[in-house]
């Protein structure tokens, strides 16, 4: 029975040219995490394997950095980076848990303006 839940950073926005941290956290389960996959729509960005560590997909190695923790840092953001990101936790005995993050990439001035009106 799958009792765990994934908490994510939810909907986030960041400036074009800037960087953003994608974070997920699996809680409420004693399942062992064997691997975390980070995907953007249908593209695999990176994995963190419990035995062998981080592996970044060749097409993203210049703009993706592992961490912090099981999170992922996206750098030099472009408008093409906007959209859905998924963290997929491979665990046993539970199976897979999936979290979703939606990233909006804004022009610098818009991002700064939006930040003044964020609800804490």
């Amino acid at each position: 029975m799958m009792t765990g839940t994934i908490e994510t950073t939810g909907n986030i926005s960041a400036e074009k040219g800037g960087s953003i941290i994608l974070q997920c956290h699996l809680s409420s389960t004693t399942a062992q995490v064997t691997q975390v996959n980070w995907e953007q729509q249908d593209q695999l960005l990176a994995i963190c394997n419990a035995d062998l560590g981080w592996h970044i997909s060749p097409s993203f190695k210049d703009r993706v950095a592992p961490g912090p923790g099981l999170g992922l840092t996206l750098q030099s953001l472009t408008v093409n980076d906007a959209g859905e990101y998924f963290c997929i936790y491979h665990t046993y005995p539970d199976g897979t848990y999936t979290g979703r993050i939606f990233l909006e990439v804004l022009e610098s001035s818009v991002a700064e303006h939006g930040a003044r009106f964020q609800i804490p």
């Epitope: 062992q32 691997q35 394997n49 592996h55 046993y92």
Partner: antibody, heavy 121, light 107 residues
Framework: QVQLVQSGTEVKKPGASVKVSCKAS????????ITWVRQAPGQGLEWMGW????????NYAQKLQGRVTMTTDTSTSTAYMELRSLRSDDTAVYYC??????????????WGQGTLVTVSS | DIQMTQSPSSLSASVGDRVTITCRAS??????LAWYQQKPGKVPKVLIY???TLQSGVPSRFSGSGSGTDFTLTISSLQPEDVATYYC?????????FGGGTKVEIK
């Protein structure tokens, strides 16, 4: 096409070491892991350990810990497995295989042809 | 460590028969299980991964099922070329232990 080509048959004396090579072609070597599996004559498959060709991280079977070392050379797309302090029960065919871990399911999708290592005095 | 137990250790069946091999994990592993076929004198070959996903190029008479601790490999209609030893393997994390194998022969 993906190919893993292993080094040839070895005959060793007890207490010696052996180093088996596994040359990969047909894919981006550093994007996958390599595992080593052995099979004693007439016996089943025994997992020995695996190594990431991306970062060099390893994980070995507990019973071989301290006697086995797995390495990779990305410049030649070659994986190596060294086994030390050989005993007669290390006589086996040694296989390397590519691990598809991107899916999260860690299965061995391509295998080398095997290297027979005989340990005999 | 999680142990993998296969049964039977050997079986003999007629061409066209439905053949079932079982694999049991000592603890739950969800669907992190692969099946391999090793023909006499040949290199092992993956048939199924993720418990039920058929590897590309594998005939559709092979199928896998199960989750948790109990898994099954089924050959829907045994063919002469299926004579081999079949191994299950836990594929979640190290150690990536194999079952003891099931030898399939033709009657």
């Amino acid at each position: 096409q993906v190919q893993l080509v292993q080094s040839g048959t070895e005959v060793k004396k007890p207490g010696a070491s052996v180093k088996v090579s596994c040359k990969a072609s047909g894919y981006t070597f550093s994007s996958y892991a390599i595992t080593w599996v052995r099979q004693a004559p007439g016996q089943g498959l025994e997992w020995m350990g695996w190594i990431s060709a991306y970062n060099g991280n390893t994980n070995y079977a507990q019973k071989l810990q301290g006697r086995v070392t797995m390495t990779t050379d990305t410049s030649t797309s070659t994986a190596y497995m060294e086994l030390r302090s050989l005993r007669s029960d290390d006589t086996a065919v040694y296989y390397c295989a590519r691990v598809d871990f991107w899916s999260g399911y860690n299965y061995f999708d391509y295998w080398g042809q095997g290297t027979l290592v005989t340990v005999s005095s | 460590d999680i142990q993998m137990t296969q049964s039977p250790s050997s079986l003999s069946a007629s061409v066209g028969d439905r053949v079932t091999i079982t694999c049991r994990a000592s603890q739950g592993i969800s669907n992190y299980l692969a099946w391999y076929q090793q023909k006499p004198g040949k290199v092992p070959k993956v048939l199924i991964y993720a418990a039920s996903t058929l590897q590309s190029g594998v005939p559709s008479r092979f199928s896998g099922s199960g989750s948790g601790t109990d898994f099954t490999l089924t050959i829907s209609s045994l063919q002469p070329e299926d004579v081999a030893t079949y191994y299950c393997q836990k594929s979640n994390s190290a150690p990536l232990t194999f079952g003891g194998g099931t030898k399939v022969e033709i009657k």
